[in-house]
Structure formats: C-alpha cells, structure tokens
C-alpha cells in the first residue's frame, strides 16, 4: 500500500455521512496537523471489514467527536 | 439504480496492450474512489489500481508499476485503465468498484468498496 506522503490526509475526499452503529469497532479522531489540515474520523469496522472514513461534518460524526471529547477532557 | 460496467477486455498477445473502461450511472463520480481488481482462476481477487475523483491521486499494485495507467473523465463519469506490456500473468476477470470514504491505506483493499461491476475478461497469450 501507498506510504503516508507530507501534506497528504488518510482520508480520500469527504467521507461517508453514516456507519450503523452496530457495526463500529472503534472510533479514531485525527486533528488538523501538518499532514492534513481537517479534523478526521476514521471508523474501524468490526470482524475485520476494514476501516472507512466519516465526514467530519456529518450529524454521525459531531456525535462521536463530542463524545470522544468529553471522555479524554 | 447504481451501476459499473466494465468494456474493453479481450485476447491480447504478450507485450500487448488493452483499455478498460469502467462506466459508472446512477451516481457520479465526485466523493468517489474508483479501483480495479483483478481475480484469475482459484486466486482472490486482488487491488490493482485506484484512483480518486477528489484530488486525482491514483494507486497502484507493485506488479503493475509502470505498466498500467488509471485515469478518469469525470464528465463522461467513466474511469479507464490503460494496461501495457501486458504479461500472461495478467490474465484474470477485472472488475471496477466504487468505494466512499476510503482511506489511502486501504485504496487496494476489495473492503472499501460498496458497488462492483459484472467484470471483463483479460486473456494474455500468445
């Protein structure tokens, strides 16, 4: 698979709008840094079906960044 | 209804040269990532190149490096794959995909694809 590039999000494009629940492992938040300058969600799926991309600005997506938040804060 | 269709496969002798199409209705490509697979006889299928509508970055197989070219047109809403020098090893049914929210990791993985087309068969002989 491709590396990482500088500059370069883990994300292509704008993500989905929804994940069922059901089907979440785990929930990451990548903060704006040098290598990308939007906030990221990134889905981990469960029984290995890989990972998937949530549009940050998606009501799926506030919701998990609200609660990721409270719970490091 | 969303749909892929594949065109463009056939005979082709080593060292030859073939362009896929894959033609995409029913959703455009905008957001999406576009792959091609490949699957042989009795093998998996396997991630052979993608490419993205948002920024145009596109992804490729080590074994198909500097042989095979992914490109799109967004106004036809169709994505092409040129293969060249084009090996008996190729030979498999290519299949393209769309995935949504896919992550550059995982552009050659058949998990980040929802919609697939019905495939085209490659053959490479002599």
């Known amino acids: 698979f491709p590396m990482f590039k500088r500059g370069r999000c883990l994300c292509i494009g704008p993500g989905v709008k929804a994940v069922k629940v059901a089907d979440i492992e785990k929930a990451s938040i990548m903060y704006p840094s040098n290598n990308c300058d939007k906030i990221e969600v990134i889905i981990t799926l469960k029984e290995n079906k890989g990972q998937r991309c949530l549009n940050p600005k998606s009501k799926q997506a506030r919701l998990i960044i609200k609660k990721v938040e409270r719970k490091n804060f | 209804e969303v749909q892929l269709v594949e065109s463009g496969g056939g005979l082709v002798q080593p060292g030859g040269s073939l362009r896929l199409s894959c033609a995409a209705s029913?959703?455009?490509?905008?957001?999406?990532?576009i792959g091609w697979f490949r699957q042989a006889p009795g093998k998996e299928r396997e991630g052979v190149s993608g490419i993205s509508s948002s920024d145009g970055s596109t992804y490729y197989a080590d074994s198909v490096k500097g042989r095979f070219t992914i490109s799109r047109d967004n106004a036809k809403n169709t994505v092409y794959l040129q293969m060249n020098s084009l090996k008996p090893e190729d030979t498999a049914v290519y299949y393209c995909?769309?995935?949504?929210?896919?992550?550059?990791?995982?552009?050659?993985?058949?998990?980040?694809?929802?919609?697939w087309g019905q495939g085209t068969q490659v053959t490479v002989s002599s």
């Open positions: 995909a769309a995935g949504m929210g896919v992550l550059r990791l995982w552009v050659l993985s058949k998990l980040s694809y929802d919609y």
């Open positions: 029913g959703f455009t490509l905008d957001d999406y990532v």
